[in-house]
């Protein structure tokens, strides 16, 4: 008998996520500038590196969760009735939404402690030390950059926030805790709040990105950066939950 | 039917006590600079603002678990019987107590978190770089203050104990857990866990205020600071808790 | 009727150990360079000597979850049956390796937070601030030290998935997930998971060490600093583990 | 009530040296407060020459070229200037003034209490 | 070192009028972080110590009466007084604390007309 069988699907996308994630981050944050510069950034994989790959497969696999329903919508709409069987994938794929949820947030925590971990860093400590020489030798008073001090102290509060919704579906996914609730409720959590964490995180990585949109230094080799692949899916998925929860169609497939 | 009925008043009280808290540091920490100086403190509401929302909700909901208990015992000895009826609002609160244990752990989480990103943003980056430029300016080779030192380190310390703590309440509260335990151990856990962990987060508070008691500075607008409204109640409680445990009164409860 | 039987012997070791290796870490962080040059350390023992104790702790709970399973292999090697009963002691023990890794859980976690708070202690921005004073008075442009910087990012994060791992097994302990889980798939979490987490936490404590192994200065008073103790237990249990993996060892144990 | 009493001051030479005292009562000099030696050329302007803060380390004007050293006696509660190599130009009213000490929100603040002054006047 | 410049350098004026002094630094006395104009104004009477009357710009120091009031940010900053008392004929100094060594403007000197 197979081990895990409802994990297989959810964790086998995971690990392709997190593989070519690793693959792009290595080559735009290590390999680009050893190439191009000799600077050898290899220090960077064990947390920085890492720490692009866990976000990206996070809100990934969140879209995921939430993608199937979207797909199933626009086919029950196409077909006009709810009675035709869904195809095999589209069925595999709803029966795993929990796993996938699960695994997003375990690596949205896991993203979390990472980037807490950031200021206890050696790495940063010194950093911190050269730019504090840096600033007493340019005789600069004043380190303040406002747009940036406001960029990450939204970015931070929606990510924890995010992370917090995210935390309660994981808490009403324990069993005995699921069956303490009636089906209404737990359906209110798992889709209300989910798109609402969905949301969080896309916000969260789009104030992240901030004005890096259009900074061409972000387009290392002509690559975009991680964030930009990592919120196209999310915002497909907003975009046609948004269309969906329009009156005209809301109506259509409430009917069917 | 309705979703979730014994949520309904802890989340009240939770978004009341929220809010007012909100409103009233914005008040002091934002609104006022502005008012009286100019200045604009609005990156503060994001991180810094909702972070002193966060334990007062926190610590105040769970006194308001605690606190029920109290009124019961008093007007058990009031009445002088067990078996007379409690009144309507005072046990439905009682019912209603495991969801307020449950929020407070929840907002103490976040408060954790929020509090752990602190070194992390760009605001604290930048203010460290002014002080160590200041600090040269000033010629001044160490910056070191004990007495705030030693305040930083025991709460903080505390404060990680009494999450500890309160996490293992949240966790013997999910279903399956609960019911592995005898009776008795789930009210040991609950009881007296409970009551620790509420006098760890009032000495965390206690603490974190130090000798800002007596400074000036802290009264903005003739108001005090929001921890000395935050430790009002969970004082309260715990000194009748206190009360109610001297030998002469708890006999006379326990022959009740 | 006694409370929470089960948790006795856990938490009685994990006392044991918790308060020897305070009182150690004080001898060695507080009380030596009291006695040998009159320096005050004592704002070390809220945070740092608690942290030093932690990590101890859980390892070395969580290398006697999987000891026993030695020890009981090695016996029915000796005894060529696994019909034999074992020992009162380590049936005792067998019993209650599940609390002995929730414990461990929870401590680990208690370090990571400990951990996760360094850089928001004021102790440390002061360090920080005192050391770039002297990178300016030394005029030193770079305080960057390569090795340090790789030792700490890969403990960090060898840390932080071997948490997550130790996340896992203690989610997987809860009685409502256990019981969805098959006997097959329960198993294989806890025991290979459970090492590859024990293997992970003892790299993350030998990184730590890194070059200190030889370095004379971390013997005060000739005693070995508190890593060299911890790794102990988990490398022989470890050793053992690999051993009893031999092809030739493994088939003798799968024929008992 | 803060007071802050200079003493010190009179004729001296060009070349010589004089220490100016500044008694402070009514405050601890090593509580929360930096003291800073200001002076003013007659009919001139006021012109900072330096400080030292409540841990005892100093700042000292650039343009005073190291020849004046601050120090404080905490079990007299009192400042001190020693000025050495005195020209003609360092003829001036010497000023002690109080400042509340560096802290890491507001970082740095005015002088608030000052005293009334003493004068040094080099000439031969 | 920040320039301090002072203007005018004097002035003659009756009771009752409203003055206006200005004082301009070489660089900004703003510190972003905090919000804050390191700037401060004190008032000296002949053969006196100066006396603190503004500091951070615009806050009055305690005890100094509400027809004084300082304003400005950055770099440009103004002393307002805005009705003339006998005892307000005095010089007026500005200051900029926001790094060392602290530097002051040359005076403005406020007579009576």
């Known amino acids: 008998q197979e081990l895990f069988p409802q994990w297989h699907l959810p964790i086998k996308i995971a690990a392709i996520i997190a593989s070519l994630t690793f693959l792009y981050t290595l080559l735009r944050e290590v390999i680009h500038p050893l190439a191009t510069s000799h600077q050898q950034y290899f220090y960077k994989i064990p947390i920085l590196v890492i720490n692009k790959v866990l976000p990206m497969v996070s809100i990934t696999l969140l879209a995921l969760v939430y993608l199937p329903g979207v797909i199933a919508a626009i086919v029950q709409l196409h077909n006009g009735t709810k009675y035709k069987k869904f195809p095999h994938w589209l069925d595999k794929w709803m029966l795993t939404r929990k796993q996938f949820g699960l695994l997003s947030f375990f690596f949205a925590v896991l993203h979390a402690i990472y980037s807490l971990s950031y200021p206890m860093r050696r790495s940063y400590r010194y950093k911190l030390l050269n730019w504090a020489y840096q600033q007493v030798q340019q005789n600069k008073e004043d380190a303040w950059i406002e747009h940036d001090v406001w960029r990450m102290e939204i970015y931070v509060s929606l990510g924890i926030v995010g992370l917090a919704i995210l935390a309660l579906l994981a808490v009403t996914s324990i069993p005995s805790v699921s069956d303490s609730l009636t089906w209404r409720e737990f359906h209110y959590i798992q889709s209300k709040l989910g798109i609402v964490s969905l949301l969080l995180g896309t916000i969260h990585a789009l104030i992240f990105a901030w004005n890096k949109w259009i900074d061409i230094k972000q387009f290392v080799w002509y690559t975009p950066p991680t964030f930009m692949i990592a919120v196209f899916l999310p915002i497909v998925v907003l975009i046609f939950k948004s269309i969906l929860f329009l009156p005209c169609l809301r109506k259509k497939i409430l009917k069917i | 039917q309705e979703l979730f009925p014994q949520w309904h008043l802890p989340i009240k009280i939770a978004a009341i006590i929220a809010s007012l808290t909100f409103l009233y540091t914005l008040l002091r920490e934002v609104i006022h600079p502005l008012a009286t100086s100019h200045q604009q403190y609005f990156y503060k509401i994001p991180i810094l603002v909702i972070n002193k929302v966060l334990p007062m909700v926190s610590i105040t909901l769970l006194a308001l678990v605690y606190l029920p208990g109290v009124i019961a015992a008093i007007v058990q000895l009031h009445n002088g019987t067990k078996y007379k009826k409690f009144p309507h609002w005072l046990d439905k609160w009682m019912l209603t107590r495991k969801q307020f244990g449950l929020l407070s752990f929840f907002f103490a989480v976040l408060h954790a978190i929020y509090s752990l990103s602190y070194p992390m943003r760009r605001s604290y980056r930048y203010k460290l770089l002014n002080w160590a430029y200041q600090q040269v300016q000033q010629n001044k080779e160490d910056a070191w203050i004990e007495h705030d030192v030693w305040r930083m380190e025991i709460y903080v310390s505390l404060g990680i104990v009494g999450l500890a703590i309160l996490a293992l309440l949240a966790v013997t509260s999910i279903p399956s857990v609960s019911d592995s335990l005898t009776w008795r151990e789930f009210h040991y856990i609950q009881s007296k866990l409970g009551i620790v962990s509420l006098l760890l987060g009032t000495i965390h508070a206690l603490i974190f205020a130090w000798n800002k008691w007596i400074d000036i500075k802290q009264f903005v607008w003739y108001t005090p600071p929001t921890f000395m409204i935050a430790v009002f109640l969970p004082i309260v409680v715990l000194i009748f808790k206190s009360i109610l445990f001297l030998p002469c009164l708890r006999k006379k409860i326990l022959k009740i | 009727q006694e409370l929470f039987p089960q948790w006795h012997l856990p938490i009685k070791i994990a006392a044991i150990i918790a308060s020897l290796t305070f009182l150690y870490t004080l001898l060695r962080e507080v009380i030596h360079p009291l006695a040998t040059s009159h320096q005050q350390y004592f704002y070390k023992i809220p945070i740092l000597v608690i942290n030093k104790v932690l990590p101890m702790v859980s390892i070395t709970l969580l290398a006697l979850v999987y000891l026993p399973g030695v020890i009981a292999a090695i016996v029915q090697l000796h005894n060529g049956t696994k019909y034999k009963k074992f020992p009162h002691w380590l049936d005792k023990w067998m019993l209650t390796r599940k609390q002995f890794g929730l414990l461990s859980f929870f401590f680990a976690v208690l370090h990571a937070i400990y951990s996760l708070s360094y850089p928001m202690r004021r102790s440390y921005r002061y360090k920080l601030l005192n050391w770039a004073y002297q990178q300016v008075q030394q005029n030193k442009e770079d305080a960057w030290i390569e090795h340090d910087v790789w030792r700490m990012e890969i403990y960090v994060s060898l840390g932080i998935v071997g948490l997550a791992i130790l996340a896992l097994l203690a989610v997987t302990s809860i009685p409502s997930v256990s019981d969805s889980l098959t006997w097959r798939e329960f198993h294989y979490i806890q025991s290979k998971l459970g090492i590859v987490s024990l293997l992970l936490g003892t790299i993350h404590a030998l990184i730590f060490a890194w070059n200190k192994w030889i370095d004379i200065k971390q013997f005060v008073w000739y005693t070995p600093p508190t890593f060299m103790i911890a790794v102990f237990l988990p490398i022989v249990v470890l050793i053992f583990k690999s051993i009893l993996f031999l092809p030739c060892l493994r088939k003798k144990i799968l024929k008992i | 009530e803060v007071q802050l009493v200079e003493s010190g001051g009179g004729l001296v030479q060009p070349g010589g040296s004089l220490r100016l005292s500044c008694a402070a009562s009514?405050?601890?000099?090593?509580?929360?407060?930096?003291w800073n030696w200001v002076r003013q050329a007659p009919g001139k302007g006021l012109e900072w020459m330096g400080y030292?803060?409540?841990?005892?380390?100093?700042s000292y004007n650039p343009s005073l070229k190291s020849r004046f050293t601050i120090s404080r006696d905490n079990s007299k509660n009192t400042l001190y200037l020693q000025m050495n190599s005195l020209r003609a130009e360092d003829t001036a009213v010497y000023y002690c003034?109080?400042?509340?000490?560096?802290?890491?929100?507001?970082?740095?603040?005015?002088?608030?209490?000052w005293g009334q002054g003493t004068l040094v006047t080099v000439s031969s | 070192d920040i320039q301090m410049t002072q203007s005018p350098s004097s002035l003659s004026a009756s009771v009752g009028d409203r003055v206006t002094i200005t004082c301009k630094s070489s660089?900004?006395?703003?510190?972003?972080?905090?919000?804050?104009?390191?700037l401060a104004w004190y008032q000296q009477k002949p053969g006196k110590a100066p006396k603190l009357l503004i500091y951070?710009?615009?806050t009055r120091e305690s005890g100094v009466p509400s027809r004084f009031s300082g304003s400005g940010s950055g770099t440009d900053f103004t002393l307002t007084i805005s009705s003339l008392q006998p005892e307000d004929f005095a010089t007026y100094y500005c200051?900029?604390?926001?790094?060392?060594?602290?530097?002051f403007g040359q005076g403005t000197k406020v007579e009576i007309k």
């Open positions: 003034a109080r400042e509340r000490n560096y802290d890491y929100d507001d970082y740095y603040y005015a002088m608030d209490y």
């Open positions: 009514g405050y601890s000099i090593t509580s929360d407060y930096a």
């Open positions: 030292i803060s409540n841990s005892g380390s100093t």
């Open positions: 660089q900004s006395l703003l510190y972003r972080s905090n919000q804050k104009n390191y």
């Open positions: 951070w710009a615009s």
């Open positions: 200051q900029q604390y926001y790094n060392y060594p602290r530097t």
